[in-house]
């Protein structure tokens, strides 16, 4: 079996203030079972912006039905952007872990860059 | 951590209904599968049913579909197994389990509840 | 429906040998590319336990003595190096369509 590859096909995406932004990402296997999660920027200091696993995230929906068999697209969509939304998405994928998840492989970035309103 | 835990052991007389609850923690309720396993003392394990609580897709195992129904409380992570017209035959542990690859799995167990039939 | 068929039913092995458990589907459950066959432990008294996922994958935190393999109609589990603690009965089960179980095959020390 191929080791699994995280794809995130856009490397930008340019979003007007107030609009919805489309971040795409697919994984090429269902091997590791685990959850996917965002992040904006990267390192330590990344900032979770949907963990698939757990938590709260009223401005994001997935593009898929994530419950549904054979299911490997987990883009999301970010609603009202705003300038402070702007920098490099990253898709990754963890593997099931006990007592954690760990994280096993991310994808090559998206940066997303706000066109201001017209005023 | 994930925890599924269930409602405790219940004794009933034939053609009595039985319902048994399994709460979930510690992960998003409404991004997984629970499926609902039987087993009889001493016996295998039978599988009766499945239930997406995104939007309460079930599949059934043909032998428990006109007695057995699935919901879902998603404000309480809460999943319910309902068993109607019980027979002696019933008598066993009923397990919860959570699929976290969306493959028709179980990858998370509840400790099981055990349900007695008996006049 | 797949009718899954495990055999032996039950098997004796020496602490420190080989176990291998069998499980026959009655007919192919490969699909999309994956063999959609699992196995699960199950020790007295405890909900089983995932071992192996799509029939080759050992699960998280499952010692590297257990492996899976076969593809199509037949699998096997397999323990390089019997422990105590894998006294136990084993589940295999399918998903190529709605899941069903083996009817278990029951570990011992020899």
């Known amino acids: 079996e191929e080791e699994l590859q995280v794809i995130q096909p856009d490397k930008s995406v340019l979003v007007a203030a107030g609009e919805t932004a489309t971040l795409r990402c697919t994984a090429t296997s269902l091997i590791p079972v685990g959850p996917i999660q965002w992040f904006r920027g990267a390192g330590p200091g990344r900032e979770l912006i949907y963990n698939q696993k757990e938590g709260h995230f009223p401005r994001v929906t997935t593009v898929s039905d994530l419950t549904k068999r054979n299911n490997m697209d987990f883009s999301i969509r970010i609603g009202n952007i705003t300038p402070a939304d702007a920098g490099t998405y990253y898709c990754v994928k963890f593997r099931k872990g006990s007592p954690d998840d760990v994280e096993f492989k991310s994808g090559a970035g998206t940066e997303l860059s706000v066109r201001a309103k017209p005023s | 951590q994930v925890q599924l835990v269930q409602s405790g052991a219940e004794v009933k007389k034939p053609g009595a209904s039985v319902k048994v609850s399994c709460k979930a923690s510690?992960?998003?309720?409404?991004?997984?599968?629970i499926n609902w396993v039987r087993q009889a003392p001493g016996q295998g394990l039978e599988w009766i049913a499945m239930i997406d609580p995104s939007d309460s897709e079930t599949h059934y195992n043909q032998i428990f579909k006109d007695r057995a129904t699935l919901t879902t409380d998603t404000s309480t992570s809460t999943a319910y197994m309902e068993l109607r017209s019980l027979r002696s035959d019933d008598t066993a542990v009923y397990y919860c389990a959570m699929d976290y690859g969306s493959l028709y799995a179980m990858d998370y167990w509840g400790r099981g509840t055990l349900v007695t039939v008996s006049s | 429906d797949i009718v899954l068929t495990q055999s032996p039913d039950s098997l004796a092995v020496s602490l420190g040998e080989r176990a291998t458990i069998n499980c026959r589907a009655s007919?192919?459950?490969?699909?999309?590319?994956?063999?959609?066959i699992f196995w699960y432990q199950q020790k007295p008294g405890q909900p089983p336990k995932l071992l192996i996922y799509?029939?080759?994958n050992r699960d998280s935190g499952v010692p590297d003595r257990f492996s899976g393999s076969g593809s199509g109609t037949d699998f096997t589990l397999t323990i390089s190096s019997l422990q105590a603690e894998d006294v136990a009965v084993y589940y295999c089960q399918e998903s190529r369509e709605l899941p069903t179980f083996g009817q278990g095959t029951k570990l011992e020390i020899k």
């Open positions: 510690g992960y998003t309720f409404t991004n997984y599968w």
């Open positions: 799509l029939a080759s």
């Open positions: 007919k192919s459950v490969s699909s999309s590319g994956y063999n959609w």
